[in-house]
């Protein structure tokens, strides 16, 4: 009994699944006529067929017969050949349409359609567009509007032809979707905000496109807009000059750091050491007299302009070199000094000598062993072996030219 119920339930599920899966997808444009064929129906009456509809206009399944008549005729009627005719498809006509027909021989044929409707909106437009944008701050570029779409679809923005991703690199988008109370068509609005980079493109090109909700329909793009990017104040490079060059100084020596800003007026200059502000009054020059280990570190200056935010210079490294050592080259970060280099070379030299000695001893042993085993067959062979041994020798001694 339970097994029978289970089988029955499965048959029901599968039949419903089959009904959906086996359906032929039809897309129809709103306002246009639609003809759905009833397969297997005799071409002329008398016909044994019926259409079943489950759409936005029906409570559940609505049955239509070839006899027709009544208010439904204005929405859908069965044609003499058995096809179902909808004179002007509307949003409420989305749904399932089924036909069951029996031919003269009593063979039953079923047709199953899944109808979706669409409406392509007018070309989208950018309204309320800005002719100028301020660099470094968020600006409203404009609002893209698409009217009269079904399904809703989506709006997307492009910069110089490439898609703009919201919440990335100062890009934000505010979207709004409204549905017309009578037509049921959608109006989409998308407001674009961007923060143009200082020193970026002075004439960026923005456009907006509408992508339909149903596939196989191409996107519609607006005419592009090209606002100018305005930078209220010059973006000047903050230069940090170090004396002595390279920032390496002997203990007790003096380092002079100068912060050069070409901007007008002269901004306030603050100093940083290892990323921490130094508690000093603003000054374009920082003098470090009688350098000690505590003064070693990475220095930079920050210029604060009255008309725009702070700008930091490149960082320079200040290091102490022992007397007799040569400072690192300009721009290098600190110096290990020649002392360390000499030590490293000494160690390498020692290792090299040891390797050379071991190589020589092993070679001599091999030579002796070879002589004991057998004398060379001819002069050529002996020369060849000598050559081979010679080429091995320098490798063992770190390419040194001298013999043992």
């Amino acid at each position: 009994m339970a097994a029978g119920t289970a089988v029955g339930a499965w048959v029901l599920v599968l039949s419903l699944w089959g009904a959906v899966v086996g359906a032929q997808n039809i897309t129809a444009r709103i306002g246009e006529p639609l003809v759905l064929k009833c397969k297997g129906a005799p071409k002329k009456p008398p016909q044994r067929l019926e259409w079943k509809l489950n759409t936005g206009r029906t409570e559940a399944w609505k049955v239509l017969s070839p006899q027709g008549g009544g208010p439904w005729d204005s929405v859908a009627r069965v044609l003499p050949n058995g096809s179902l005719f909808l004179p002007a498809v509307g949003i409420q006509d989305e749904g399932i349409f089924r036909c069951q027909a029996m031919n003269r021989n009593g063979k039953e044929t079923k047709s199953n359609y899944r109808v979706r409707v669409y409406q392509i909106p007018g070309k989208p437009e950018i309204v309320d567009s800005a002719s100028e944008l301020t660099a470094g701050v968020p600006n409203k570029v404009g609002t893209c509007v698409s009217e009269g779409s079904y399904p809703a679809g989506t709006l997307s923005w492009h910069l110089d032809g490439k898609p703009l991703v919201p919440n990335e690199k100062g890009v934000s988008v505010k979207e709004q979707t409204r549905r017309h109370p009578e037509t049921g068509l959608f109006t989409l609005q998308s407001e674009l905000m961007v923060t143009p980079a200082r020193g970026g493109d002075p004439r960026p090109t923005f456009s907006c496109s509408f992508s339909p909700g149903l596939p196989r329909h191409r996107a519609l793009r607006t005419a592009p807009i090209q606002p100018r990017v305005w930078e209220p104040v010059p973006l000047e490079e903050v230069q940090l000059v170090v004396e002595p060059e390279g920032g390496a100084v002997a203990p007790g020596g003096t380092v002079t750091l100068t912060c050069e800003v070409p901007a007008q007026p002269s901004p306030q200059i603050h100093w940083m050491k290892d990323g921490v502000p130094l508690p000093l009054p603003p000054s374009p020059v920082l003098i470090l007299p009688e350098i000690g280990p505590q003064d070693q570190g990475t220095y930079s200056c920050v210029a604060t302009h009255s008309s725009h935010g702070p700008q930091e210079s490149r960082a320079v490294s200040i290091s102490i070199i022992e007397p007799g050592e040569e400072g690192p080259t300009a721009g290098s970060v600190g110096g290990s000094g020649l002392g360390t280099l000499a030590l490293a070379l000494g160690i390498l030299g020692g290792l090299g000598t040891a390797a050379l000695l071991i190589g020589v001893i092993l070679w001599q042993r091999r030579q002796r062993r070879g002589e004991e085993r057998k004398a060379p067959e001819n002069q050529e062979e002996e020369e060849e072996r000598a050559e081979l041994n010679q080429s091995e020798e320098p490798e063992a001694g770190e390419s040194s030219t001298g013999g043992p």
């Epitope: 800005a130 002719s131 100028e132 944008l133 301020t134 660099a135 020193g199 002075p202 100018r228 990017v229 305005w230 930078e231 209220p232 104040v233 010059p234 973006l235």
Partner: nanobody, 120 residues
Framework: EVQLVESGGGLVQAGGSLRLSCAAS????????MGWFRQAPGKEREFVAT????????HYTDSVKGRFTISRDNAKNTVYLQMNSLKPEDTAVYYC?????????????WGQGTQVTVSS
């Protein structure tokens, strides 16, 4: 090339107002981003306010925000600086400047300046 002539400076009591004008002649005025700068005795020239090509965008130095207003009339080739609630520290020679750089931020053309004196 553009020529700039400032006017409207003078002596005013603290708390008073002045309106500076800068008339431009030469090339198309709307191609230039405009700015006002000032230089007090013994000090560096400092930025005051700037306005974009169309006049839609403006920018001020912190010390004048809420008191000064920059505007422009492209039909009259003129840029204005309305100065309200003037303070003695606003005393300076005020210069008008024009920029035809891509971003409108490098000032290539300067006027001769107009003196503004605010007495306490």
């Amino acid at each position: 090339e553009v020529q700039l002539v400032e006017s409207g400076g003078g002596l005013v009591q603290a708390g008073g107002s002045l309106r500076l004008s800068c008339a431009a002649s030469g090339r198309t005025f709307s191609n230039y981003s405009m700015g006002w700068f000032r230089q007090a005795p013994g000090k560096e020239r400092e930025f005051v306010a700037t306005i974009s090509w169309s006049g839609a965008l403006t920018h001020y130095t912190d010390s004048v925000k809420g008191r000064f207003t920059i505007s422009r009339d492209n039909a009259k080739n003129t840029v204005y600086l309305q100065m309200n609630s003037l303070k003695p520290e606003d005393t300076a020679v005020y210069y008008c400047a024009a920029s035809d750089s891509d971003y409108g931020n490098k000032y290539d053309y300067w006027g001769q300046g107009t003196q503004v004196t605010v007495s306490s």
